[in-house]
């Protein structure tokens, strides 16, 4: 039994890091393998992650981590019984994939303005809380070409757009994702989408 593709890990910078790897053949990850991880810090304890299958030869492990900060560095040991298959390290702050924003809501009762709001996926005492910026994707269910991205580079989790920038009388969907420039993160997954019917009063033509 050998590792074909070494583990690569990403952290949500809150409580979970996800590591994926591939073996050289079909493997029952949960019964045959264990991923041990330990913070390089005084008093730290070794933890064991039981991997799940991710395709025939693929494995995935969800590492539980408390109080993740930039200085953290973890040793990783992949074991098959008594055999050490791979040894490495992982610094969560250098491989961050933020959690997806939640509670996306479209407020249509503001005069001819659409207000989109969502929730920051981190609590205020998490270091990512004040460093997230967002991308909002709006698209028409009727017209695949009517697809747009709004970059929200301020910290407030909201976006205002004029209803007239979208077509009236049709349904739209929106979703939002997040990233943090200061940690050079990847984009989060998209939030669940929300749907609304866009309607506004056309201005009278002279």
């Amino acid at each position: 039994m050998k590792v074909l593709q070494e583990p690569t890990c990403v952290s949500d910078y809150m409580s979970i890091s996800t590591c994926e790897w591939k073996m050289n053949g079909p493997t029952n990850c949960s019964t045959e393998l264990r991923l041990l991880y330990q913070l390089v810090f005084l008093l730290s304890e070794a933890h064991t992650c039981i991997p799940e299958n991710n395709g025939g030869a693929g494995c995935v492990c969800h590492l539980l981590m408390d109080d993740v900060v930039s200085a953290d560095n973890y040793t990783l040991d992949l074991w098959a019984g008594q055999q050490l298959l791979w040894k490495g390290s992982f610094k969560p702050s250098e491989h961050v994939k933020p959690r997806a924003p939640g509670n996306l809501t479209v407020h249509t009762n503001v005069s001819d303005t659409l207000l989109l709001t969502w929730s920051n996926p981190y609590p205020p005492d998490n270091y990512l809380y004040n460093h997230l910026t967002y991308a909002v994707n709006i698209w028409s269910e009727n017209d695949p070409a009517d697809f747009r991205i709004y970059n929200v580079t301020y910290l407030e989790p909201s976006l205002r757009i004029a209803a007239s920038t979208l077509k009236s009388g049709i349904s739209y969907r929106a979703r939002v994702r997040a990233w943090a420039q200061c940690y050079n993160t990847t984009w989060s997954e998209w939030s669940p989408s929300t749907k609304w019917h866009n309607s506004y009063r056309e201005p009278f033509e002279q």
């Epitope: 810090f41 900060v69 200085a71």
Partner: antibody, heavy 116, light 111 residues
């Protein structure tokens, strides 16, 4: 919100022991390390030790080895720092602080005066 | 005995800029991250900077940190009278299983 509430001021005689408490609230107590530091009057900060509330393991600064004991009570989300064989130079404000590599939350401090 | 050296005192007029240095070695600052704490008279220290240069929520951008080699610097611009306090750098010692260490402290006086 995160709060670390420390016990009140103490006056002790040389040779006695003191036990200072630090009650945590507003977060998952066992998920964060707790440090203790002290500050003598007009002096700088001095690290004393650390406790992992999850398992109760500790590590102490060499200077305090054998004199300091840090414990925790998960049922009340409280950590304790006991310093024995007190001498006049132990007169200081004692702080608990939450964190690993740096400390974002601090208790207000407990003044311990050692005087005969 | 602290192995991180800071100037005992610095001073500047309101609105000016001041810097506070923190000098260490390869087994601490050179191989670690630096944090900075502000201690107003009669109060507990407060985290100003972590990760060498990042600010926690609520800390104004007048405060900034940097690190180069075995030294670190805290800069405060647009000085205000309320900034008068003691400032401490902090890091950890990689030669003693990551025990934290503090600087000697710097008293900032706003003239």
């Amino acid at each position: 919100q995160v709060q670390l509430v420390q016990s009140g001021a103490e006056v002790k005689k040389p040779g006695a022991s003191v036990k200072v408490s630090c009650k945590a609230s507003g977060y998952a107590f066992t998920s964060y390390y707790m440090h203790w530091a002290r500050q003598a009057p007009g002096q700088g900060l001095e690290w004393m030790g650390i406790i992992n509330p999850s398992g109760g393991s500790t590590s102490y600064a060499q200077k305090f080895q054998g004199r300091v004991t840090m414990t925790r009570d998960t049922s009340t989300s409280t950590v304790y720092m006991e310093l024995s064989s007190l001498r006049s130079e132990d007169t200081a404000v004692y702080y608990c602080a939450r964190g690993k590599w740096w400390w974002q939350y601090w208790g207000k401090g407990t003044l311990v005066t050692v005087s005969s | 005995q602290s192995v991180l050296t800071q100037p005992p005192s610095v001073s500047a007029a309101p609105g000016q800029k001041v810097t506070i240095s923190c000098s260490g070695g390869s087994s601490n600052i050179g191989n670690s991250y630096v944090s900075w704490y502000q201690q107003l008279p009669g109060t507990a220290p407060k985290l100003l900077i972590y990760d060498n240069n990042k600010r926690p929520s609520g800390i104004p951008d007048r405060f900034s940190g940097s690190k180069s080699g075995t030294s670190a610097t805290l800069a405060i611009t647009g000085l205000q009278t309320g900034d008068e306090a003691d400032y401490y750098c902090g890091t950890w010692d990689t030669s003693t299983t990551y025990h934290p260490i503090f600087g000697t402290g710097t008293k900032l006086t706003v003239l």
